[in-house]
Structure formats: C-alpha cells, structure tokens
C-alpha cells in the first residue's frame, strides 16, 4: 500500500509534467506556425522589393538612353543652327580653327579634309588683318592653304586659283625647290615660304552656315 | 502486487511519453533558433533591397531632371541665333574671345565688361583642358579673372565664388603681397600669380546664346 | 641654402657679343622670377632685364632693347643673358638676382660676373 | 641719371640716428613698394628692407623703411662702423615697366 501510494505520486508528478510539456508543445507549435506566416510575408515583401528594384533598374535604362539621345541630338541641333561648329571661329563668311597639333603640309591639309574644311586661304586685305590678329599672341608658324612645286611654277591655293600678288609678300625660301614642294607659312603676320615636309601648327578654314535660322 | 504491476506499467509509459515530448521540445527549440535566424536574415536582406530601391529612385530622379533640362534645352536651341558673336570660340556652354592687346588686370576686366562678358573662370578640369588646348600654341600670359588681395586672403574669382583647391596650383608670387592686388594668369597651361599691374594678354568669357531669340 | 653663381663674363671687343650664364641651387627655381643687375666700375646698380617663372613676360631696360635677351631653362636651373652689339658703356659686373615675384624686391644675389667691352 | 633721387651722401657718428630719403614719381613709388639695399665694399648688395617697411629675418631691427606717397625713407639708429656702404632704393616702374634703382647713398660713420 505504502509502494502503491508511492507510485500513484509518482504517476500524478509525472502526469503533471506531461501535461506541462503537452502544453509547451501546443505552444511551441502556435509560434511556429506565427513564425512560418511571418516568414512567408517577409518572402513575399522580398519577392516585391526586388520586382520593383528591376523594374527601376530598366527604367533608369532607359532614361539613360533617353538622356544621351537628347544630348547628341542637342548637339546635332545646336551645330546646326550656328554658323560654326564648337570650338571653331565665326569671322565674317567663315569659320577658322586654330590647330593644336604640328603636322607637315599634307598631313595638316588631310586633317582639315576631315573636318569637312580646307587650310587656311586669304582672300583680301580684311581676311589678311583678321588673321594677323587672330595669331598675334602666337610666336609659332602656322601652314596656309598656298603652295607651289618648285620656283618656276605660281602660288597656288588649295582650290587651284592664283595668289592675288598686292595681298603679301612672300619671304624665306621662295627660290628653293624642295621634293614635297615649297608652301606657304604665317607667322607674327609676315607669310614664308618653307619646306611643305616641316611640321608646324595650321589654320583650317570653311564656309560659315549662314542660312536663315 | 497487481495493482503495482499497473501502476509500474503505467508510469513507464508516462515516462516514455514524457521523454518523447522532451525530445519534441528540444527539436521544436532548434528549429526556432533556426526559424528566427532566417528570419533576421530575410529582414537584412529586405533592408539591403529597400536601401539599394532607394538610391536607384534617387539616381532616378536626378536622370529625370536631367532629362527635362534637355528637353527645355533642346526646345530653345531648336530654335535659336548664333551661340556667340563673330571672333569668339563657342565651346559646351561659353563663348571666348582671345585679347589682342596687352593691358593690366583691372583694364584687361573692363574690356571683358564692355563686352558684356568676364575675364575668364575655370569651373572644372574640362574647362582648364579647353582652354590649356586653346592657348597651346602661346607663349604669352593671359590674365584670368582670378585675384586675391594678399596672401592672408583667399583667391576669388570675379562673381565672388572661391577658388576650388583641385583644379589647378597657383606658382609663381603667391607670398607677395601688391598694392595693386595679386591677380592669377594662365600661360602654357599653368597658372601663376602676380601684380594685377602688368599689361598681359586676356581671355574674355560670357555664356553662349542657346536661348530662343 | 641659396646659391646664384653667374659665368661668362670676359673681355669682348665693341660690337662682339657675350652669353652669361647664372647656375642656381638651393629653391625651386621655377618659382622665382629672375633678373640680371648691372653696376659699371665705381657707379650704381642699374637694372637690365627680368624674366618671369615660365618666360611669359620679359622686360628690358632702354639701354639694352634690342641688344640684348633674357632666358631661363627651368630643366636646368639657369638663366642666361645673350649680350649683342656690345658697346664701352656696357662694361660692368653683371649680378643676377631672385625675386619672390615679377615686381617685388631681389632677396639674393650672386657674386657677380665681369664684362669688360674694349678694343 | 637714375629714375629715383637719392642723396650721393649722409654722415653720422657712432649711436647717432641716420635717414635716407628716395623721392620717384606716381608710376613707382606712388604705385608700388620699395625696396631696399645695402653694398658693402666688394661685395654684392644685400636686401635690407622689401614691401617698404618690411625687414628680412637676420636684418637687425635699427633699419626701419617707411613710405609716403612719392617718397621713400631709410633710417638707421644706434649707428655702428660696419654700416658703412652704399644703400640703393628700389621700385617697380609700371610705365615704363621696368626695375627702377635710386643712384645709391654712401653712408659714412664718422671718427
């Protein structure tokens, strides 16, 4: 009875703790399922974060795309409607750009060429003045558009037509013969005449767009 | 003697059942730490997405002004006159003109004035590149609209704004001090300080005219 | 420390002409402007030329407009004074000179190198 | 003739206190600072005084420059023997844009 009794206390302790932990379990069980809900949401908030990311992602695409269309038709436009292209000058009928680089004769015409231009031709007194004080804070040489293939033959600009004899004097070596011929440099406002195979700076030359705007 | 073999019986099975739910319990405890390790996880990730959202809407919103500037700039250049007047340089957003005399600083100023212009001011590293590259075939100094009036001043420009330390360094009398002022100038692609009283060359500069006439 | 040592100086006959140099140490040399001072036996220091950090501006006395230039080769620290058509009057000690700025004082000198013009 | 009048000489005992006068025009010293320079005998001048007033370090405080409109002046106090030497003054010309020299000053130290 004694041993009875025992184990029914026994029985009632370990009732008890079944009980208990049946109970830790159905609530174990309910946060479980709380914490499945609430990672299936935080999942979901994932899945709609990163949809809207790419979606932002193409849109950036695309106005990036927008923006460099607009800028090259900016570009486009704006060379349009000026009467020169940037970096040129604007002086009466023409534009002039002033080169950077030093090249020989040809290579300083071909490089002009593929600027839609022609180097340098003076075509009176004005164009002459303009030059002469465009390039007077210059101490350099700069190719003009005028040469000829040995002493015996005239000047002759790029376009075939003669030097008009009262615009300048030409100086320097105007009785040599050189194989790539002798051409025509201004510097500090006096032409020479050189060796076409020296490298020197250039002045090329076109048309300015001068169409109703 | 029955009775206890029952009981015996009994609380065997109560304490295998109990184990079992211990053994539950512990398994059910292992998956929560799991579960919420995942979750902190998944919530890191949620703040990286948002994060990385919003610095792409920013970006976003600054491509969009962008875009709209284009677009208004765009509207006006379609129609508009000659960026710059005849003998200047219309590079990006400016107009330049290259002095053909020498005066002082202040002189040198005046003229830009009367202009409607003013003496040069470098903004970036691109604008120092155009204007070293416009130069490259000078010797001479061209004062800029840079000044300072001693050393315990800093240097401005004409509008006010200071200089921005990365753009270039300023050789030559930065420690003299001058009645006259210290004014900067630029030759051969660097920039130098000296006494606003000397007669140098000038660079002018006012914004080119892309706005519908 | 700052040095200025001039050299080429020498007896030259009227009309000849003369390139001094001045080696310089001791600063960063293309921070300074430079000029040549010149003091003829027994008179004053009279100023020649002076040239600034990069040989942008170059300024010349009246006397010597025309006769003689001024250059610097920054890569060499040196700056030279070619003299032409040297006359008598151009005897002197020949002196060049540093200057913090174009136009402000001369903070060293050299020794000093002496041109004598004589037939 | 130089650009800038100096006296040809000043004279002084030992302690006694000296000045120098520089007189130019409004395109030098109206315009610009003085500078100036002591020569002893056989050697080469030394800066003694830039920006008008202005002394370099290792120049004694008994030289002091000051500047007046056109006009310059260099005193030395507390005379001494080894102040005997030339002195010249010195602008910039923005006319004429070039270095302008005073004659020079001989200073004499008496007894």
């Known amino acids: 009875s004694q041993v009875s009794n025992l184990l029914k206390q026994q029985q009632t302790n370990l009732t008890h703790q079944k009980n208990k932990l049946e109970g830790q379990i159905s609530a174990r069980q309910q946060a479980e399922e709380a914490s499945q809900e609430s990672q299936n949401e935080l999942k979901e908030m994932i899945e709609t974060l990163a949809w809207k990311l790419n979606e932002k992602s193409k849109e950036q695409m695309e106005l990036h795309h927008q923006n460099l269309n607009l800028q090259e038709t900016l570009k486009r436009v704006a060379n349009c409607s000026a009467p020169c292209p940037q970096d040129w000058i604007w002086h009466e009928e023409n534009c002039y750009l002033f080169s950077t680089g030093s090249f020989n004769w040809e290579k300083s015409q071909e490089k002009c060429l593929s600027l839609d231009a022609k180097l340098l031709k003076i075509n009176s007194t004005a164009d002459l003045d303009f030059i002469q004080q465009a390039i007077s804070y210059s101490s350099f040489p700069f190719w003009m558009g005028l040469s000829r293939r040995n002493p015996s033959y005239p000047w002759l600009w790029e376009d075939g037509s003669p030097l008009m004899p009262h615009l300048f004097r030409i100086r320097g070596a105007v009785s040599q013969t050189y194989p790539s011929g002798t051409c025509a440099y201004i510097q500090r406002g006096a032409v020479y005449a050189e060796n076409c195979i020296l490298a020197a700076f250039s002045i090329c030359q076109k048309k300015a767009n001068l169409r109703a705007q | 003697s029955q009775v206890s073999n029952l009981l015996k019986q009994q609380q065997t099975n109560l304490t295998h059942q109990k184990n079992k739910l211990e053994g539950q319990i512990s398994a059910r405890q292992q998956a929560e730490e799991a579960s919420q390790e995942s979750q902190n996880e998944l919530k890191e990730m949620i703040e990286t997405l948002a994060w990385k959202l919003n610095e792409k809407s920013k970006e976003q919103m600054e491509l969009h002004h962008q875009n709209l500037n284009l677009q208004e700039t765009l509207k006006r250049v379609a129609n508009c006159s000659a960026p710059c007047p005849q003998d200047w340089i219309w590079h990006e957003e400016n107009c330049y003109l290259f002095s053909t005399g020498s005066f002082n600083w202040e002189k040198s100023q005046e003229k830009c004035l009367s202009l409607d212009a003013k003496l040069l001011k470098i903004n970036s590293t691109a604008d120092l590149d155009f204007i070293q590259q416009a130069i490259s075939y000078s010797s001479f100094p061209f004062w800029m609209g840079l000044s300072r009036r001693n050393p315990s001043y800093p240097w401005l420009w004409e509008d006010g704004s200071p200089l921005m330390p990365h753009l270039f360094r300023i050789r030559g009398a930065v420690s003299q001090t001058y009645p006259s002022g210290t004014c900067a100038y630029i030759q051969r692609g660097a920039v130098y300080a000296e006494n606003c009283i000397l007669a140098a060359f000038s660079i002018c500069q006012k914004k080119a005219n892309l706005r519908a006439q | 420390q700052v040095q200025l040592l001039e050299s080429g100086g020498g007896l030259v006959q009227p009309g000849g002409s003369l390139r001094l140099s001045c080696a310089a140490s001791?600063?960063?040399?293309?921070?300074?402007?430079l000029h040549w001072v010149r003091q003829a036996p027994g008179k004053g220091l009279e100023w020649v030329s002076v040239?600034?950090?990069?040989?942008?501006?170059?300024f010349y006395a009246d006397s010597v407009k025309g006769r003689f230039t001024i250059s610097r080769d920054n890569s060499k620290n040196t700056l030279y004074l070619q003299m032409n058509s040297l006359r008598a009057e151009d005897t002197a000690v020949y002196y060049c000179?540093?200057?913090?700025?174009?136009?402000?004082?001369?903070?060293?000198w050299g020794q000093g190198t002496l041109v004598t013009v004589s037939s | 003739q130089s650009v800038l009048t100096q006296p040809p000489s000043v004279s002084g005992a030992p302690g006694q206190r000296v000045t120098i006068s520089c007189s130019g025009s409004?395109?030098?010293?109206?315009?610009?600072?003085v500078s100036w320079y002591q020569q002893l005998p056989g050697t080469a001048p030394k800066l003694l005084i830039h920006?008008?007033?202005h002394r370099p370090s290792g120049v004694p405080d008994r030289f002091s420059g000051s500047k007046s409109g056109t006009s310059a002046s260099l005193a030395i106090t507390g005379l001494q023997a080894e102040d005997e030497a030339d002195y010249y003054c010195?602008?910039?010309?923005?006319?004429?844009?070039?270095?302008?020299f005073g004659g020079g000053t001989k200073l004499t130290v008496l007894g």
């Open positions: 000179a540093r200057s913090p700025g174009l136009t402000s004082y001369h903070d060293s």
């Open positions: 001791g600063f960063t040399f293309s921070d300074y402007a």
């Open positions: 040239i600034s950090y990069a040989g942008g501006f170059k």
């Open positions: 409004s395109s030098n010293i109206g315009s610009n600072y």
């Open positions: 920006s008008s007033s």
């Open positions: 010195q602008s910039w010309d923005y006319e004429s844009e070039r270095v302008v």
